[in-house]
């Protein structure tokens, strides 16, 4: 057979040949970082001629072209500079908002050598919608400008850019957009390992957190009971072994998967791992139905024994069959455990697909994904029970659209990635679960299943009491510190007599702790403004208690996430460079923010935190409170910007004994404390000894009920001063380096 000509050099780059100059050989070009090859490859045809995939005309000279990042197509409610058609590597684009709009995301973004922008989409939002403004990523066009419950927005990419993420999103009842942010990227772009590792890792650690990590397995316990107690994770690893995957690549796939398995077993969760290699047909090396799938040594052994030659007779890429074998495994397990049982329904499923290209046989893999979603009953409520990560390796033949179609779409997360080569994949797996350092005290995980106890739903909630009667509530913010209100300690009684009850006082989980030290804000003085006719003033109503021992983490005792910390950043699944301001913009992101506090009887009650102009009207009614504030001229003397305000509409009001407890929000199935209960105009428990009885204020009451909570975003310096060694705090805001 004729060989292909050898005049195929690329100026400024290099090339490799899969099978020399013979027909069937694939010539692959590569360029230095910041440049990309055009064309990317050529194939030696049996005629002895080179063919360029997708090219219409005959052989053109191969060149290394400069990578560029896409320009904004439109930017709402603000301006961006400079305005270019596309941006060179290292180039910046800056965003500013019009008056009345707050900038969420990155004010300055830089074009990176892989053709992708750093930071996150800049959005100018006024917080008026039920959902936050979803923004328009660079290079995208959005249709749909209403952000109310049920409203939809659609995205497409300009020119030849490829869309990854969701092309359509819907504003859901919980104020979160369905799916994941769409990104428009150059067809030749790929992801850097340092971006993929934290994205994969935080998504994974969230899932591990939701699986209730720290329950040690008691060997004597029946396994099904154990699954019911603390959830279970099925991890399915799918390794491409088709012809285009070299033996070297396959070895690194194996090493990467082994690393993943090793890390996953280091979390104290119940996990079963399935291993499937595939080419034209799948080969199940380990099934979740096999008891050995729970044994790390056995799983790694099955990976170790995976042989590159297992698939030498069928060399296509049948991704459908690989995913379908996962579906069949799930089906068998469901039949075994029983479709209606908690043992089946509480299993979370994660699929990691490692592939080097597009499926070329067996039909659409999307069909298998649809079957999997169906069998697991994945809907908005159960969205967290399935994660599919689609990871393409090698820039050449990877089909972005197919990967994107297969990967899960979740708000604030990415599940589809393309890496330059298998070594980059290995780097990702080496670093993706470094967050394991944090999992022992993983924050903000509450059990949300219907049969969970109150304490399991809010495991951070603690009761603070002197020797006699109960007085205050508080929140665990680490394994040894409790955040509460300063006014609980205003009688100055010796705190050595006080006790903190952690876990449910009504069960064996409840445990009394002594207080090693109380740190009460020096600024708190209830009588500070007495001579201004303000009989009680609650500025700086914040205190920290250090417990005499560390709390053993369990499903009944676990810290809540404090915003502006690295721990909360992971739980929010935000990028690494995030700031305290970013957290505030994300958590308090509209004019009425749904939140909760915990009642005396342990149940979770609902409030709405009023922001912006609504905060002003919420606080204004304090002027009608003539007993406490006889001659008040300025409401802001009492309600400073340290306070969050609730109590309008259908809000519940906290009772006296609920002071110091957390005011918290739920985001992405995790819980974040934004405030603490301080004071109010109405006590619904007045005159009742029954913890379960609360009286709503009559509609005609003057002043109407209002409740004020210390805003933790306004207490950052004090929190940092005392918790700097306990939590990892983020910078307060971005420091911009303008490049001129």
């Amino acid at each position: 057979a004729p060989s292909c000509p050898q005049n195929v050099n690329i100026s400024g780059g290099t090339f490799t040949l899969s099978h020399g100059w013979a027909p069937g050989s694939l010539l692959t070009y590569s360029c230095p970082q910041g440049l990309y090859p055009s064309p990317a490859s050529r194939l030696c045809k049996s005629s002895g001629q080179w063919q360029t995939p997708g090219a219409t005309r005959s052989l053109s000279k191969a060149v290394c072209k400069p990578v560029r990042c896409p320009a904004p197509v439109s930017f709402e409610n603000g301006i961006y500079t400079p305005r270019l058609g596309s941006y060179p590597v290292g180039g910046n684009v800056s965003f500013e908002c019009e008056d009345g709009f707050i900038l969420r995301g990155s004010p300055v973004r830089q074009c990176r050598p892989n053709g992708m922008w750093d930071g996150e989409t800049a959005v100018c939002d006024n917080g008026a919608g039920h959902c936050p403004n979803p923004g328009i990523s660079l290079g995208a066009v959005r249709t749909g400008f209403r952000f109310g419950h049920g409203d939809k927005v659609r995205y497409r990419c300009s020119s030849n850019l490829v869309l990854t993420g969701s092309s359509e999103r819907e504003c859901q009842g919980n104020g979160v957009w369905s799916g994941t942010e769409p990104i428009c990227r150059q067809p030749y772009s790929y992801d850097f390992p340092e971006d993929v590792a934290p994205a994969l890792g935080t998504s994974f650690s969230h899932m591990l957190g939701a699986t209730n990590p720290t329950q040690k397995t008691k060997e004597s316990l029946g396994r099904k009971i154990q699954i019911q107690r603390s959830g279970h994770l099925n991890l399915y690893l799918l390794l491409d072994c088709s012809q285009s995957v070299s033996e070297n690549d396959f070895l690194i796939f194996k090493e990467s998967a082994s690393l993943m398995v090793d890390r996953i077993f280091s979390f104290e969760i119940n996990v079963s791992v399935a291993i499937i290699t595939f080419a034209s047909e799948p080969k199940v090396l380990m099934s979740v139905l096999n008891d050995n799938s729970r044994d790390m040594t056995e799983v790694i052994s099955s990976l170790e024994n995976a042989n590159y030659k297992d698939h030498e007779n069928g060399t296509g890429t049948n991704t459908y069959a690989a995913l379908n074998s996962v579906y069949l495994m799930m089906n068998n397990q469901m039949r075994l455990l029983g479709m209606e049982t908690m043992a089946w329904q509480e299993i979370r499923h994660a699929i990691i697909l490692l592939t080097d290209g597009k499926s070329n046989m067996g039909g659409s893999p999307k069909t298998a994904v649809d079957h999997i979603r169906e069998i697991l009953n994945i809907n908005q409520k159960r969205n967290d029970y399935l994660d599919i990560y689609a990871i393409g390796v090698g820039k050449l033949d990877v089909d972005w659209r197919e990967l994107n179609e297969l990967g899960s779409k979740k708000d604030g997360e990415r599940h589809a990635f393309i890496l330059q080569d298998t070594k980059a994949l290995h780097q990702v797996f080496e670093h993706m679960l470094d967050v394991s350092k944090l999992t022992d005290t993983i924050c903000g995980v509450g059990n949300m299943s219907a049969n969970a106890s109150d304490q399991e739903r809010t495991p951070w909630h603690v009761t603070i009491k002197p020797k006699s009667q109960e007085t205050c509530r508080g929140a665990l913010i680490s394994d040894q510190w409790v955040l509460t209100a300063a006014h609980c300690f205003r009688d100055g009684n010796d705190h050595s007599l006080w006790r903190v009850n952690v876990g449910d006082p009504k069960s064996q989980w409840g445990k009394e702790f002594l207080i090693e030290k109380a740190v009460i804000s020096p600024g708190f003085d209830v009588f500070a403004k007495k001579n201004q006719g303000i009989l009680e003033f609650y500025g700086d109503d914040i205190a920290l208690l250090k417990l005499a021992q560390k709390v053993k983490m369990s499903t009944h005792a676990r810290p809540i996430c404090l915003p502006c910390t690295m721990e909360a950043n992971l739980a929010l699944r935000r990028p690494q460079g995030s700031t305290c301001r970013d957290h505030e913009n994300e958590l308090l992101n509209k004019q009425s923010v749904p939140a909760h506090f915990v009642a005396l009887n342990g149940s979770k009650l609902n409030i709405n935190l009023k922001m912006g102009v609504e905060w002003t009207s919420c606080a204004e009614v304090v002027s009608q409170e003539k007993t406490m504030f006889p001659n008040l001229t300025d409401v802001r003397e009492v309600v400073t910007d340290q306070f969050l305000c609730s109590g309008t509409q259908e809000d519940e009001s906290p009772c006296k004994g609920e002071s110091g407890g957390a005011v918290f929000l739920e985001r992405r199935f995790r819980f974040f404390q934004v405030g603490l209960v301080s004071w109010g105009l109405y006590n619904p428990c007045l005159g009742s000894a029954d913890k379960n009885s609360r009286k709503r204020a009559p509609r005609s009451k003057v002043p109407p009920p209002r409740d004020f909570h210390i805003n933790l975003f306004r207490m950052q310096p004090w929190l940092r001063q005392h918790l700097g060694d306990v939590l990892n705090f983020l910078p307060l805001h971005h420091h911009h380096h303008h490049h001129h």
């Epitope: 033996e247 090493e255 170790e304």
Partner: antibody, heavy 119, light 108 residues
Framework: EVQLLESGGGLVQPGGSLRLSCAAS????????MMWVRQAPGKGLEWVSS????????NYADSVKGRFTISRDNSKNTLYLQMNSLRAEDTATYYC????????????WGQGTLVTVSS | QSALTQPPSVSVSPGQTATITCSGD??????VSWYQQKPGQSPVVVIF???KRPSGIPERFSGSNSGNTATLTISGTQAMDEADYYC??????????FGGGTKLTVLR
């Protein structure tokens, strides 16, 4: 501190047998790929054999196939090399080395044990 | 015959940069480790996974690997760096492959 300590070397006649051991400490032995590498006096390094973390996968250099057997006891954190039908050309310092999880990416070496095959 | 090719010797003046190469088919697809061996001592890992330096190894040691060639670079070479250097990777079917070794001489 991660350590590998070889033992069992010595003088043996051609055709004889010897069993080398390598005691591992300072890391989770059962998770890693292990191997034996040898170095004849004044020569370069030569890979001899390797074994997967569970012991299920073994590989040998052509020069020792059928004569040497690699094994491991994860409960004792020990790697072994059973050497039979020894020849003069097997004379070398034998090193035990720790690899990755399934790859032979060596990152720790032992101090070696000398095997002399001579009549 | 070794599947990895190294130059038998490299000489360098103190303070200069020494470069030792290791070539093999599609080596860039694999991970390469580099070992330093001084007379009478066991080998020591100076670079693994192409570019990683174990703790305790000076920063002047660095590695790279692409195409068919891996390179060990010692910048600001010192007399104590005089030793034999070996590269290593894996071959097909689970075997391990070593280069023939390079004797680095630091000129006096």
């Amino acid at each position: 501190e991660v350590q590998l300590l070889e033992s069992g070397g010595g003088l043996v006649q051609p055709g004889g047998s010897l069993r080398l051991s390598c005691a591992a400490s300072g890391f989770t032995f059962s998770r890693y790929y292990m191997m034996w590498v040898r170095q004849a006096p004044g020569k370069g390094l030569e890979w001899v054999s390797s074994i997967g973390s569970s012991g299920g996968t073994t590989n040998y250099a052509d020069s020792v196939k059928g004569r040497f057997t690699i094994s491991r006891d994860n409960s004792k954190n020990t790697l072994y090399l059973q050497m039979n039908s020894l020849r003069a050309e097997d004379t070398a310092t034998y090193y035990c080395a720790k690899g990755g999880m399934v790859l032979g990416v060596v990152n720790i070496w032992g101090q070696g044990t000398l095997v002399t095959v001579s009549s | 015959q070794s599947a990895l090719t190294q130059p038998p010797s490299v000489s360098v003046s103190p303070g200069q940069t020494a470069t030792i190469t290791c070539s093999g088919d599609k080596l860039g697809e694999k991970y390469v480790s580099w070992y330093q061996q001084k007379p009478g001592q066991s080998p020591v890992v100076v670079i693994f996974q192409d570019i990683k330096r174990p703790s305790g190894i000076p920063e002047r040691f660095s590695g790279s690997n692409s195409g068919n060639t891996a390179t060990l670079t010692i910048s600001g070479t010192q007399a104590m760096d005089e030793a034999d250097y070996y590269c290593q990777t894996w071959g097909t079917g689970g075997i391990q492959v070593f280069g023939g070794g390079t004797k680095l001489t630091v000129l006096r």
